[in-house]
Interface confidence: low
């Protein structure tokens, strides 16, 4: 028995073409980079920019490159032993909750609160209440002062696979 | 709404053939998706033949069905077909071709069914 | 290949009942990558299997929440908190990761 098709973003089309490049697998696995081919005997390269595959493994395909969607920005190519890392666009971010989509930032605080943590890839802005120094979280209500931020600057990327 | 229309019942004498068929609908047919075809013997459970990969013609299958069976696809119809050779009474069967989807491993959409009967 | 083995094969119940179906496989069906392709289908008389369950415990996008799914390994398990007329039919668990994916022999569920 040879395993199957895994979780998340495996692409058939981009099965072994008879030129990639083969080798043998290692106690029945392949090593990052390749993937196994169906009767288990020969390991086959990813296609560099198409699929990958990051640990030793037994896959019947490489793993499809992520696209970075638009409001994303491509901070690191895929090749054939890393996915694409693709991050949320200035003034934009994603939260761990909803991981599908970047979401504006909010441009100010809500009244009576005080901005104390800017716009990040990863979390928008932060605010405390002036008087307590409490973190607000949860809807922001409709009245919202002026206070505008800028957008922070992207310290570290938000790795997307899939 | 992601439809499989199967072909009719067939009813064929034992060494004969028979290809039946399944037009896909409702989605991109080339998309991540693989075509896998099912026999369910009379009152008895499932058994996987093989898929067909539709967007270059890949194809796996079930070691028992090797040699018996053939799979292909037509892209320009969306349709995938299914050939059965040397037909014997084992053989008689209903035959669900399904839809796998390629990122998680299970059959989220399954055909009507097609009654192949083999009978002198 | 990998034996999938239900039990019961038959399962007769009340309606508003509890019911609960075991699949027992050979062998781990863990896969390499950490995830175990265990998946649920009903097929009612007359019809098509359909996906109830993926991944062990994973409801397919419309199915009740009667409906659950458990276990590990090689022992895993469908509920049905209570059991509806509609939920009659042949249940059949199904491993997928590896080839060939198996089913088991179906378990039938009737009043």
């Known amino acids: 028995e040879s395993a199957l098709i895994t979780q998340q973003d495996l692409a058939p089309q981009q099965r072994a073409a008879p030129q990639q490049k083969r080798s043998s697998p290692s106690e029945g696995l392949c090593p990052p980079g390749h993937h196994i081919s169906e009767d288990g005997r020969d390991c086959i390269s990813c296609k560099y920019g198409q699929d990958y595959s990051t640990h030793w493994n037994d896959l019947l395909f490489c793993l499809r490159c992520t696209r970075c969607d638009s409001g994303e920005v491509e901070l690191s190519p895929c090749t054939t032993t890393r996915n694409t890392v693709c991050q949320c666009e200035e003034g934009t971010f994603r939260e761990e909750d909803s991981p599908e989509m970047c979401r504006k930032c909010r441009t100010g605080c809500p009244r009576g609160m005080v901005k104390v943590g800017d716009c990040t890839p990863w979390s928008d802005i932060e605010c405390v209440h002036k008087e307590s120094g409490t973190k607000h979280s949860g809807e922001v209500p409709a009245v919202e002062e002026t206070v505008t931020s800028s957008p922070g600057t992207p310290a570290s990327p938000c790795s997307l696979s899939g | 709404e992601v439809q499989l229309q199967q072909s009719g019942p067939e009813l064929v004498k034992p060494g004969a053939s028979v290809k039946i068929s399944c037009k896909a609908s409702?989605?991109?047919?080339?998309?991540?998706?693989?075509l896998n075809w099912v026999k369910q013997s009379h009152g008895k459970s499932l058994e996987w033949i093989g898929y067909?990969?539709?967007?270059?013609?890949?194809?796996s299958y079930n070691q028992k069905f090797k040699g018996k069976t053939t799979l292909t696809v037509d892209k320009s119809s969306s349709t995938a077909y299914m050939e059965f050779r040397s037909l014997t009474s084992e053989d008689s069967a209903v035959y669900y071709c399904?839809?796998?989807?390629?990122?998680?491993?299970?059959?989220?959409?399954w055909g009507t069914g097609t009654t192949v009967t083999v009978s002198s | 290949d990998v034996l999938m083995t239900q039990t019961p094969l038959s399962l007769p119940v009340s309606l508003g009942d509890q019911a609960s179906i075991s699949c027992r496989s050979s062998q781990s069906i863990v896969h390499s990558n950490g995830d175990t392709y265990l998946d649920w289908y009903l097929q009612k008389p007359g019809q098509s299997p359909k996906l109830l369950i993926y991944?062990?415990?994973n409801r397919f996008s419309g199915v009740p929440d009667r409906f659950s799914g458990s276990g590990s390994g090689t022992d895993f398990t469908l509920k049905i908190s209570r059991v509806v007329a509609e939920d009659l039919g042949v249940y059949y668990c199904f491993r997928g990761s590896h080839i060939p994916p198996t089913f088991g022999a179906g378990t039938k569920l009737e009043k």
């Open positions: 991944k062990v415990s």
């Open positions: 399904t839809r796998g989807s390629n990122w998680i491993w299970y059959f989220d959409v």
């Open positions: 067909i990969y539709p967007n270059n013609g890949d194809t």
């Open positions: 409702g989605y991109t047919f080339t998309d991540y998706y693989y």
